[in-house]
Interface confidence: medium
Amino acid sequence: ELCDDDPPEIPHATFKAMAYKEGTMLNCECKRGFRRIKSGSLYMLCTGNSSHSSWDNQCQCTSSATRNTTKQVTPQPEEQKERKTTEMQSPMQPVDQASLPGHCREPPPWENEATERIYHFVVGQMVYYQCVQGYRALHRGPAESVCKMTHGKTRWTQPQLICTGEMETSQFPGEEKPQASPEGRPESETSCLVTTTDFQIQTEMAATMETSIFTTEYQ
């Protein structure tokens, strides 16, 4: 089941998926001047069985000016650099993505890939938030959001994170007005079935991430 809305927006924060749940789709987008090969896939799909998950379909781009198809090759270093990447660098990788059952790791780049990747998340996906440069985190709880199915509708849980400017005098989190959950639903709502998968293992993964450092490369 695809998540049919966006993860919550936290002022001065961005978020990242550390691994992608089976069912996640990644658009096959090509950079300017290139297009998908005629019979090429629209998207890559994270699929798997109980022991192994991987991305089905290959994205392939060809020059818009020619009719020839390009072969799937690993980009040269300068081509890889062209793509704006956002990676997690940490002295201690939180969890090897391949070891997270039912999840795929970040797919490798393909030749002439677009500068931006477009993912379509599924129920059970977890994303992790961090404050952007120049802001620091005030935690009231986990800085993550999970896509859940509630009353037959998907929604994202509200991350308990406030990002405050380093120069600002920081208040205790309790003094700040709490942000509303998406669609105004309180997080304590338990009146109906909530479907999430792998929650236990994802929570453990989040715990290991506490000391992780995220860095964003800007061009």
């Epitope: 966006d6 987008e29 998207y43 931006e116």
Partner: nanobody, 131 residues
Framework: QVQLVESGGGSVQAGGSLRLSCEAS?????????MGWFRQAPGKKEREFVG?????????SYADPVKDRLTISRGNAKSTVYLQMNNTKPEDTAVYYC??????????????????????WGQGTQVTVSS
Amino acid sequence: QVQLVESGGGSVQAGGSLRLSCEASGPTLFSSYGMGWFRQAPGKKEREFVGAISRYGTYTSYADPVKDRLTISRGNAKSTVYLQMNNTKPEDTAVYYCAAYTYSGSFYSTVKTHHDEYHYWGQGTQVTVSS
């Protein structure tokens, strides 16, 4: 690549309403793009942010000069975005541009407000508000 076509521009009386549409087309999957509106007033070099909406229509962001008069929404097919402005003023006269942005890596914030963050642009539609 995505193509954007604006429509609905023209002349409107001050105090009236304005409704612009932007149709997105191109070989892509589902709701892949956030959409925004910018405007360029006569004699101005910069395109000014008007408002934006996230790819599923969950979030919107409006510029201060118009936020009490503006609604941006997405059509059911998600490939159309609408700008509805009420109580128009002569200073709303401008060329209005529809723009689209993709979601950057697996890291992104949901509504973009700066023109540099937009990857695709329409040709623009002229709106003239006369007093």
